[in-house]
């Protein structure tokens, strides 16, 4: 039975040209995290593999930085970066947990971070 929950940074906003940290945290499970995938729709941003380290997709290499922790830093933001982002935790023996973050990139300087919130766990299938 999957008991874990994923906490994410939730709905967040940031300024065009700036940077943002995408962060998820898996709790309430003793399952071993073997890999975390970061995706935007069907595009891979990065993978953090417990054994092999980070792989940043070539499409994002110039503006995605690994970390902090299992999170991801997205730099040089454009309005096209607005949308849903997913952290996908591959765990053993539980399976897959998915968290969702919505990022809005704003033209003006009124961008501010949304509150953290929890998403109920679920097994992830595309």
């Amino acid at each position: 039975m999957m008991t874990g929950t994923i906490e994410t940074t939730g709905n967040i906003s940031a300024e065009k040209g700036g940077s943002i940290i995408l962060q998820c945290h898996l709790s309430s499970t003793t399952a071993q995290v073997t890999q975390v995938n970061w995706e935007q729709q069907d595009q891979l941003l990065a993978i953090c593999n417990a054994d092999l380290g980070w792989h940043i997709s070539p499409s994002f290499k110039d503006r995605v930085a690994p970390g902090p922790g299992l999170g991801l830093t997205l730099q040089s933001l454009t309005v096209n970066d607005t949308g849903e982002y997913f952290c996908i935790y591959h765990t053993y023996p539980d399976g897959t947990y998915t968290g969702r973050i919505f990022l809005e990139v704003l033209e003006s300087s009124v961008a501010e971070h949304g509150a953290r919130f929890q998403i109920p766990h679920h097994h992830h299938h595309h």
Epitope: L44, L52, S57, H90
Partner: antibody, heavy 120, light 107 residues
């Protein structure tokens, strides 16, 4: 130029242990990760597992109870042991190199492969 | 495990003509796809990684596309030296898995 060369017995008896070595030349095994893949006759490629630059291993769950991958960095080689073999383990066995940072799970340097037949 | 299904099983192409190979994943794999070419009597060679990026030294007649579950390898103008079996591979999650292969022959 990096070269990988598999070696080991071409014939193994059922229930015995298959042992293969992959010698790496032209590159130090202290970075990247090092894989074993096999291809049974007429079937698709099957991923066996890897040993990382730090010595951590991953094994395909379908083979996990029978597989051991180890390395000898002083000889710049890594090895595969597969126990309790049956005819279903007859295959061409390949070793291959991966660079996770740049290419993820895509493997870009392969040995020429060695054929192992399990038969009494 | 993620199952990779390739079509067609084989392909006979006239030199200079295009060829297209499809690969479908049993679940979404984002863009974590590699393509390999295995010439007769040789080991596989990496052609494409991250679904659409050509590996060093691979001719530009080879291209990859797709994301999610559906991927394509295209050869814009097939040459005699392109004969062999082509495999897709996913590395979205472990264990990495391969398609069954597509054999390309020259007419």
């Amino acid at each position: 130029e990096v070269q990988l060369q598999e070696s080991g017995p071409g014939l193994v008896k059922p229930s015995e242990t298959l042992s293969l070595t992959c010698a790496v030349s032209g590159y130090s095994m202290t970075s990247d990760y090092w894989n074993w893949i096999r291809q049974p006759p007429g079937k698709k490629l099957e991923y066996i597992g890897y040993i990382s630059y730090s010595g951590r291993t991953y094994y395909n769950p379908s083979l996990k109870s029978r597989v051991t991958i180890s390395r000898d960095t002083s000889k710049n080689q890594f090895s595969l042991k597969l126990s309790s073999v049956t005819a279903a383990d007859t295959a061409v066995y390949y070793c291959a190199r991966g660079d996770y940072s740049n290419y993820g799970g895509a493997m870009y340097d392969w040995g020429q492969g060695t054929t192992v037949t399990v038969s009494s | 495990d993620i199952v990779m299904t390739q079509t067609p099983l084989s392909l006979s192409v006239t030199p200079g003509q295009p060829a297209s190979i499809s690969c479908r994943a049993s679940q979404g794999v984002s863009t974590t796809i590699a393509w390999y070419q295995q010439k007769p009597g040789q080991s596989p060679k990496l052609l494409i990684y991250s679904a659409s990026y050509r590996y060093t030294g691979v001719p530009d007649r080879f291209s990859g596309s797709g994301s999610g579950t559906d991927f394509t390898l295209k050869i814009s103008r097939v040459e005699a030296e392109d004969v062999g079996v082509y495999y897709c591979q996913q590395y979205y999650s472990s264990p990495f898995t391969f398609g069954g292969g597509t054999k390309v022959e020259i007419k």
